[in-house]
Interface confidence: medium
């Protein structure tokens, strides 16, 4: 069957059940339900999934059976709306159930919560986990899907199946090992970190589609796929972009069965046509489905064709530029973006999109001018400052990172961003600045040619986290402006923000700076977060504090924690020394 060309099916639910198989069907329905009803207990979701699965089986047996012709949204929405505690648990989300499809599904989507009020996932002892895994492997793995999906309501569902497969493999291997913990814990840490990164990347794709539309996503995809597959023809890249857009539109829209099915079809198509796409796909295409799709999504850029001619001939010097542009603007701009991106794997996708936007704006203006060619002849000169800006920023920040190390680099960013947008909640500032700071260890090790795509595209993902968290409870007009005006200019917009002079400093509250002996038992990461939380609060109290003042206070704070954690009577030390520290800090900062 051709990619996405399906015969009309009498029963959509039967069709997807047959395509995906029972195991994937059940897993995807569980993910979908957990992403919609994020507060519901695990057992309730399992019950709903089992009911849907039994119903799907009746439709497989007889596609003409009652209700089998209903859309998946209707079937799933009806099922979600049977939850007895909907009003008490979710408040106004219960009003969604009074709506008809497709409005009901849109309503559920709008109530997805990027920061749900759920307890932090605490990792049990290894023996406890291994016992649970052996006692009931199926329930153990379902619980993993459920816990990740409800905390990450936009997690890319087919990719979550891949994570679950790796999660299972880790327990299968390590629960038999001599040193279970040494085997298992690093694997779980890796899955956790990769999972958070995967969630954040997908969140940006969904934000791109939902806030800026399909055209914005397609432009991003043209640029990225052209960098990755520079030997593929423009028509081939366009085909992949169209299909990839469909896949992500479905997943971001909660259509997880269709999304997973279409992603599998796309992987199949890519592997069947790898000769005309990329020489780097061979290994990926030998893997099983979930691994194959993941591998394709992460595959390295193919080598650029050796004999690519100058871009200027077709896009500046040709007398047909305005004619070609007028005939089909998006196709012509798509060709420009394709040609530019395949020549520049060293540029970030967002930079390529800024260049394409500049080119488009120039043609809009010049093709209406008396002498179009004279008007657009120097368009490529306008690209120079756009290219240099991220290059310089990355150079400066990598130098700072190499000088300070990750923790202190994060602190520098915490201070910088708190001064820019002090109204943002402290937990959000800490989370976002810590992630921004990770760009150093992630990207600064790369050679020049790989730094910009690594750094700027990663920063786009992190700043999107700030945007989605801020959208839930907007407190800063400056954040709203940078987040909503232009997807590709978010990072330059935030970079350009200076200290917010309109901010009225927060009242000093000694309680914020009171610490207890429990800090001593925290992991190094948790201890860092405590210190960084205090740093943000300091800046909110004293936005005009100098680097030197803040450094002195933070050094005193670190010494205070170290001293009291070594004391015999830790709690007394924290109480007495803490008062002295607060007083000294107030004096140092002039509070």
């Amino acid at each position: 069957r051709g990619v996405f060309r399906r015969d009309a099916h009498k029963s959509e639910v039967a069709h997807r059940f047959k395509d995906l198989g029972e195991e994937n069907f059940k897993a995807l329905v569980l993910i979908a339900f957990a992403q919609y009803l994020q507060q519901c207990p695990f057992e309730d979701h399992v019950k709903l999934v089992n009911e849907v699965t039994e119903f799907a089986k009746t439709c497989v047996a007889d596609e003409s059976a009652e209700n089998c012709d209903k859309s998946l949204h209707t079937l799933f929405g009806d099922k979600l709306c049977t939850v007895a505690t909907l009003r008490e648990t979710y408040g106004e989300m219960a009003d969604c159930c009074a709506k008809q499809e497709p409005e009901r599904n849109e309503c559920f989507l709008q109530h997805k919560d990027d920061n749900p009020n759920l307890p932090r996932l605490v990792r049990p002892e290894v023996d406890v986990m291994c016992t649970a895994f052996h006692d009931n492997e199926e329930t153990f793995l379902k619980k993993y899907l459920y816990e990740i999906a409800r905390r990450h309501p936009y997690f890319y569902a087919p990719e979550l199946l891949f994570f679950a497969k790796r999660y299972k493999a880790a327990f299968t291997e390590c629960c038999q090992a001599a040193d279970k913990a040494a085997c298992l814990l690093p694997k779980l840490d890796e899955l956790r970190d990769e999972g958070k990164a995967s969630s954040a990347k997908q969140r940006l794709k969904c934000a791109s589609l939902q806030k800026f539309g399909e055209r914005a996503f397609k432009a991003w995809a043209v640029a990225r796929l052209s960098q990755r597959f520079p030997k593929a023809e423009f028509a081939e890249v366009s085909k992949l972009v169209t299909d990839l857009t469909k896949v992500h539109t479905e997943c971001c829209h909660g259509d997880l069965l269709e999304c997973a099915d279409d992603r599998a079809d796309l992987a199949k198509y890519i592997c069947e046509n790898q000769d005309s796409i990329s020489s780097k796909l061979k290994e990926c295409c030998e893997k099983p489905l979930l691994e194959k799709s993941h591998c394709i999504a992460e595959v390295e850029n193919d080598e650029m064709p050796a004999d690519l001619p100058s871009l200027a001939a077709d896009f500046v010097e040709s007398k047909d530029v305005c004619k070609n542009y007028a005939e089909a603007k998006d196709v012509f701009l798509g060709m420009f973006l394709y040609e530019y991106a395949r020549r520049h794997p060293d540029y970030s996708v967002v930079l390529l999109l800024r260049l394409a936007k500049t080119y488009e704006t120039t043609l809009e203006k010049c093709c209406a001018a008396a002498d179009p060619h004279e008007c657009y002849a120097k368009v490529f000169d306008e690209f120079k400052p756009l290219v240099e800006e991220p290059q310089n920023l990355i150079k400066q920040n990598c130098e700072l990172f190499e000088q300070l190390g990750e923790y202190k680099f994060q602190n520098a960013l915490l201070v910088r961003y708190t001064k820019k947008v002090p109204q943002v909640s402290t937990p959000t500032l800490v989370e976002v600045s810590r992630n921004l700071g990770k760009v150093g260890s992630k990207c600064c090790k790369h050679p020049e040619a790989k730094r910009m795509p690594c750094a700027e595209d990663y920063l786009s993902v992190v700043l999107n986290q700030l945007c989605v968290l801020h959208e839930k409870t907007p407190v800063s007009d400056r954040v709203t402006k940078c987040c909503t005006e232009s997807l590709v200019n978010r990072r330059p917009c935030f970079s350009a923000l200076e200290v917010d002079e309109t901010y009225v400093p927060k009242e000093f509250n000694a309680e914020t700076f009171t610490f207890h002996a429990d800090i001593c038992t925290l992991s190094e990461k948790e201890r860092q977060i405590k210190k960084q939380t205090a740093l943000v609060e300091l800046v909110k109290h004293k936005p005009k504090a100098t680097k030197e003042q803040l450094k002195a206070v933070m050094d005193d704070f670190a010494a205070f924690v170290e001293k009291c954690c070594k004391a015999d009577d830790k709690e007394t030390c924290f109480a007495e020394e803490g008062k002295k520290l607060v007083a000294a800090s107030q004096a140092a900062l002039g509070l």
């Epitope: 051709g2 023809e233 001619p309």
Partner: nanobody, 119 residues
Framework: EVQLLESGGGLVQPGGSLRLSCAAS????????MLWVRQAPGKGLEWVSV????????YYADSVKGRFTISRDNSKNTLYLQMNSLRAEDTATYYC????????????WGQGTLVTVSS
């Protein structure tokens, strides 16, 4: 040797329909993206529509969107253009061509078929 042979043109009244065909040989049709271009009397070339080797996606010039439909039958090595709601400004010689590998240069095209829209 690459050959592209267009047919189906003719005289039609405004608002009428025509279906153009293009028989291809001499290259692997089912791995080639194809397009229709046209040239009105005394004017330059204008591209009309593109179709990927698999049949999707398809692209249309703004001037024909919603009226023309491009399709292909890979088993017959044939490209089609269904033209509805024809207008006088659609009068042109229509050529089928193999889509360019990258730049705006078309690799191969046929002799063309004339479409005249007039009352």
């Amino acid at each position: 040797e690459v050959q592209l042979l267009e047919s189906g043109g003719g005289l039609v009244q405004p608002g009428g329909s025509l279906r153009l065909s293009c028989a291809a040989s001499g290259f692997t049709f089912d791995t080639s993206s194809m397009l229709w271009v046209r040239q009105a009397p005394g004017k330059g070339l204008e591209w009309v529509s593109v179709i990927h080797q698999s049949g999707t996606p398809t692209y249309y010039a703004d001037s024909v969107k919603g009226r023309f439909t491009i399709s292909r039958d890979n088993s017959k090595n044939t490209l089609y253009l269904q033209m509805n709601s024809l207008r006088a400004e659609d009068t042109a010689t229509y050529y089928c061509a193999k889509f360019p590998s990258s730049r705006m240069k078309f690799d191969y095209w046929g002799q063309g078929t004339l479409v005249t829209v007039s009352s």
